[in-house]
């Protein structure tokens, strides 16, 4: 495939990445699948600058990101290292709270109304953000 040189229609370009901001809500797994079908992934926040950019676009609305601990340790969906990477949790988060009675913890991370992160029940129908890198090889065949 060819390298993507500009963002798809209705996506926003920022620092060599393209972002798409939903205006409806889905459970985390459905949002993750939606982004994958768009040849993208749920947003991976790697810097304070990117955090501010995303926060500006989503406003004070609970919004899923590509961070989860459904298999144990916290993981970014694109493989970015969690331990050494950027973090912006609310105080005392993540707490992986089990009190909701679903038999598992709170395994999915989202932006809260002030932009800081919280872990929550993955079933909540929050909005979401997809991200894809401009330098990434596109799945589309090259133009002849």
């Amino acid at each position: 495939g060819s390298e993507r040189t500009c963002c798809p229609v209705n996506w926003v370009e920022h620092e060599r990445s393209c972002y798409w901001f939903s205006r409806s809500g889905k459970a985390w797994a459905d949002a993750d699948n939606y982004c994958r079908l768009e040849d993208a992934h749920l947003v991976v926040v790697t810097s304070w600058e990117e955090q501010k950019f995303v926060q500006h676009h989503i406003g004070p609305v609970n919004t899923w990101m590509g961070l989860h601990d459904q298999n144990g340790p916290w993981k970014w969906v694109d493989g970015t290292d969690y331990e050494t990477g950027f973090k912006n949790w609310r105080p005392e988060q993540p707490d992986d709270w089990y009190g909701h009675g679903l038999g598992g913890g709170e395994d999915c991370a989202h932006f809260t109304d002030d932009g800081r992160w919280n872990d929550d029940v993955c079933q909540r129908p929050y909005r979401w953000v997809c991200e894809t890198e401009l330098d990434k090889a596109s799945q589309e065949p090259p133009l002849l």
Epitope: L102, G103, T112, D113, R124, P125
Partner: antibody, heavy 125, light 107 residues
Framework: QVQLEQSGAEVKKPGASVKVSCKAS????????INWVRQATGQGLEWLGW????????GYAQKFQGRVTMTRNTSISTAHMELSSLRSEDTAVYYC??????????????????WGQGTTVTVSS | DIQMSQSPSSLSASVGDRVTITCRAS??????LGWYQQKPGKAPKRLIC???RLQSGVPSRFSGSGSGTEFTLTISSLQPEDFAIYYC?????????FGPGTKVDIK
């Protein structure tokens, strides 16, 4: 038994604010969301939003964003809903209802199983 | 926002009748739907979750079905205590939205 006890009726003037409380008993307060739903006389039900008492995070219906604030005091198992800039159209019975996700096999659903008795809010000049 | 509609808006029936109420969503909501019963001056009472799951303590004459955009609540044999208003509620997306209600009264 599980109960949600709401505060008494309120009469407010247009432009004022009202704060309705909802005291939980008979269960672990922080294990369920508190939802707020209202019903104008002779009308249907309208959802205002939810709050997770464990940490206080909230989700409000866009229609009420900026006018509604949901808070809690976990030490007394009480949730509060404050609505500001009141207008006559806000005259309604306001209900709190506990809710949480439940699982059946691999399917999750949201269950609002216990409701308060309702608080009548009248907005009139 | 997801819009919910109900039909009929009201119906008159007799004790022992089979009653069916339909709820439609403006977009697919899978099974993310509940049914609530409300009597005058009282808070709503939930009957059914996940479109068809009967809640404990609710009589078996109540049943729910449907998926996607069309759902039904059926009362197999109407009892005197069933005369009330019935609402559907979608929890597929925020804001949660209720149908406008169906009033079931005595013929």
């Amino acid at each position: 038994q599980v109960q949600l006890e709401q505060s008494g009726a309120e009469v407010k003037k247009p432009g004022a604010s009202v704060k309705v409380s909802c005291k939980a008993s008979g269960y672990t307060f922080t294990s369920y969301d508190i939802n707020w739903v209202r019903q104008a006389t002779g009308q249907g039900l309208e959802w205002l939003g939810w709050m997770n008492p464990k940490r206080g995070n909230t989700g409000y219906a866009q229609k009420f964003q900026g006018r509604v604030t949901m808070t809690r005091n976990t030490s007394i198992s009480t949730a509060h809903m404050e609505l500001s800039s009141l207008r006559s159209e806000d005259t309604a019975v306001y209900y709190c209802a506990r809710g949480r996700y439940s699982r059946e096999d691999y399917y999750y659903y949201y269950d609002m199983d216990v409701w308060g008795q309702g608080t009548t809010v009248t907005v009139s000049s | 926002d997801i819009q919910m509609s109900q039909s009929p808006s009201s119906l008159s029936a007799s004790v022992g009748d089979r009653v069916t109420i339909t709820c439609r969503a403006s977009q697919g909501i899978r099974n993310d739907l509940g049914w609530y019963q409300q009597k005058p001056g009282k808070a709503p009472k939930r009957l059914i979750c996940a479109a068809s799951r009967l809640q404990s303590g609710v009589p078996s004459r109540f049943s729910g079905s449907g998926s996607g955009t069309e759902f039904t609540l059926t009362i197999s044999s109407l009892q005197p205590e069933d005369f009330a208003i019935y609402y559907c509620l979608q929890h597929h997306d925020y804001p949660f939205t209720f149908g406008p209600g169906t009033k079931v009264d005595i013929k």
